[in-house]
Interface confidence: low
């Protein structure tokens, strides 16, 4: 048993049929010595008396909020949560496996630049009685500080008969140099509690590997004289690291007609302009990627030819 | 420690092309190592990230763009003195700081070159003949060093009398290649910055 936060405790259980469970001793947080009784959750049934209560925790029915009272007055609470271990593996029932980039990927993270700020997200089909707490650091032994906000519900999607919920959190490394060469990974730890079930999830990564720039901005077309051609120009996204001559991007330029018979045209360039033949109803799209370290491409920025 | 804005004239910076070749070569070599050594811990997640230049050179700090010198997290107190002569410095405007930067890059390349050559000599003795260093990568390191053209003491190739542990050598190769790829990215960024200034 260990303390998750004040008055909240996690009991680690080997989860198999007829498992003996864990013996837990609860102590009432009071100077009182006599006349103390214990109850569980909303029940008025007295489980025991005295300053301590010894219980055998085997299943979820044994978890919950234990309260010690004296003469009708509440003295203190202890909330017991269960963390299940099945066949030596901690349970992962609360979050959905996103399976990318590999199986058992529950947390996914992205950064728009090298500033040390990143966003992580995860999925669940659970809609109620659910809380998350996020901690992060650079390295695990002698960790350096990373500050994370509160996890928030960021999207809901219908998946067949089920609803799927996406939660996300923003974190910022306390003292980050965009030009630094990372040798210690960022560690992200998410505590998840659903009703009386506790689980924890971790992810480890280098910022350089989770970079995904925002799309190029100010994508514009300029007709060229006496020609069906246009000059397409765009700029680095505002969120990308500066100076741009040091943190350079490469771009993918795509031309797409409306008719299914028309082929897509696509080129890669380090420049921020290109010349394109614009057919009626076609559109031009551009996306960006770090020029030197191939992490993710940005989403597309698009403009219609008309 | 930083790069000032006053740097070589456009088109006067012969190191950019070499640094681009270097990144391509080390990336290809790393990819080859990952594939060939698929049953060894050779991915970024599996290896220990070591920097053989740590406390010997300070390329990131010496080559910091001017715009990042306001960021206290980027300013490291390590001081290293470098020789200040080089043919990539093709303009009288070149500053002392830029010379420090380029000589630091040269020292990095020299250290990695020695490590790779020593390692290749060991790998050539492996009866499995599983992997060798790409001669193109070694040639590209040499080309960039020549373009930088710093006068520097020759570092003797390390030799070992004991029987090489080929498993350890291959793991060390992976560690070196990962670190060298990261340094090659920094070098490419620096050359791009200098070329644009």
């Amino acid at each position: 048993i260990w303390e998750l936060k004040k008055d909240v405790y996690v009991v680690e259980l080997d989860w198999y049929p007829d498992a003996p469970g864990e013996m837990v001793v609860l102590t009432c947080d009071t100077p009182e010595e006599d006349g103390i009784t214990w109850t569980l959750d909303q029940s008025s049934e007295v489980l025991g008396s005295g300053k301590t209560l010894t219980i055998q925790v085997k299943e979820f029915g044994d978890a919950g909020q234990y309260t010690c009272h004296k003469g009708g007055e509440v003295l203190s609470h202890s909330l017991l949560l269960l963390h299940k271990k099945e066949d030596g593996i901690w349970s992962t029932d609360i979050l959905k496996d996103q399976k990318e980039p590999k199986n058992k990927t529950f947390l996914r993270c992205e950064a728009k630049n090298y500033s040390g700020r990143f966003t992580c997200w995860w999925l669940t089909t659970i809609s109620t009685d659910l809380t998350f707490s996020v901690k992060s650091s650079r390295g695990s032994s002698d960790p350096q500080g990373v500050t994370c906000g509160a996890a928030t519900l960021s999207a809901e999607r219908v998946r067949g008969d089920n609803k799927e919920y996406e939660y996300s959190v923003e974190c910022q490394e306390d003292s980050a140099c965009p030009a630094a060469e990372e040798s210690l990974p960022i560690e992200v730890m998410v505590d998840a509690v659903h009703k009386l079930k506790y689980e924890n999830y971790t992810s480890s990564f280098f910022i350089r590997d989770i970079i995904k720039p925002d799309p190029p901005k100010n994508l514009q077309l300029k007709p060229l004289k006496n020609s069906r051609q246009v000059e397409v120009s765009w700029e680095y996204p505002d969120t990308w690291s500066t100076p741009h001559s040091y943190f350079s991007l490469t771009f993918c330029v795509q031309v797409q007609g409306k008719s299914k018979r028309e082929k897509k045209d696509r080129v890669f360039t380090d420049k921020t302009s290109a010349t394109v033949i614009c057919r009626k109803n076609a559109s031009i799209s551009v996306r960006a990627q770090d020029r030197y370290y191939s992490s993710s491409w940005s989403e597309w920025a698009s403009v219609p030819c008309s | 420690r930083n790069l000032p804005v006053a740097t070589p004239d456009p088109g006067m910076f012969p190191c950019l092309h070499h640094s681009q070749n270097l990144l391509r070569a080390v990336s290809n070599m790393l990819q080859k190592a990952r594939q060939t050594l698929e049953f060894y811990p050779c991915t970024s997640e599996e290896i220990d990230h070591e920097d053989i230049t740590k406390d010997k050179t300070s390329t990131v700090e010496a080559c910091l763009p001017l715009e990042l010198t306001k960021n206290e997290s980027c300013l490291n107190s390590r001081e290293t003195s470098f020789i200040t002569n080089g043919s990539c410095l093709a303009s009288r405007k070149t500053s002392f700081m830029m010379a420090l930067c380029l000589s630091s890059i040269y020292e990095d390349l020299k250290m990695y070159q020695v490590e790779f050559k020593t390692m290749n000599a060991k790998l050539l003795m492996d009866p499995k003949r599983q992997i060798f260093l790409d001669q193109n990568m070694l040639a590209v390191i040499d080309e960039l060093m020549q373009a930088l053209n710093f006068n520097s003491e020759t570092v003797p190739q390390k030799s070992s009398l004991e029987e090489p542990d080929f498993y350890k050598t291959k793991i060390k190769l992976c560690i070196l290649l990962h670190a060298f790829r990261i340094r090659a990215v920094t070098i490419d960024r620096v050359m791009s910055y200098l070329n644009a200034s």
Partner: nanobody
Framework: EVQLVESGGGSVQVGGSLRLSCVAS????????MGWFRQAPGKEREFVAA????????DYRDSVKGRFTISRDNAKNTMYLQMNSLKPEDTAVYHC??????????????????WGQGTQVTVSS
């Protein structure tokens, strides 16, 4: 949940043609990006071609460009892969895939949530 069923595979001589089909269950077919991937014995699964929800945007691996054409008929909940000028190196099990979240590159496996069982294509000389 989307079920995907491929058909149209078979054996063909070098230079020959095949047309693969992939039928999807469900009523929102046009909300899914669709792709063809292939896996040769002892090799990794690799991207072949992909197409957007309305069929306006598509992409191909370099080795099949100009020989393969991906298309879809949303009214029939069906995607096609027309394969011409087939080569021995095209021999593989071809899988169709569907993905509803389109923020992943559609040439990458991670974009796709649903996969068919596959259809065998054998090209002999």
């Amino acid at each position: 949940e989307v079920q995907l069923v491929e058909s149209g595979g078979g054996s063909v001589q070098v230079g020959g043609s095949l047309r693969l089909s992939c039928v999807a269950s469900g009523r929102t077919f046009n909300m899914y990006v669709m792709g063809w991937f292939r896996q040769a014995p002892g090799k990794e699964r690799e991207f072949v071609a992909a197409i957007s929800g309305e069929g306006l945007i598509s992409d191909y691996r370099d080795s099949v460009k100009g020989r393969f054409t991906i298309s879809r008929d949303n009214a029939k909940n069906t995607m096609y892969l027309q394969m011409n000028s087939l080569k021995p190196e095209d021999t593989a099990v071809y899988h169709c895939a569907a993905g509803q979240w389109t923020n992943g590159p559609f040439t990458r496996e991670r974009t796709y949530e649903y996969w068919g069982q596959g259809t065998q294509v054998t090209v002999s000389s």
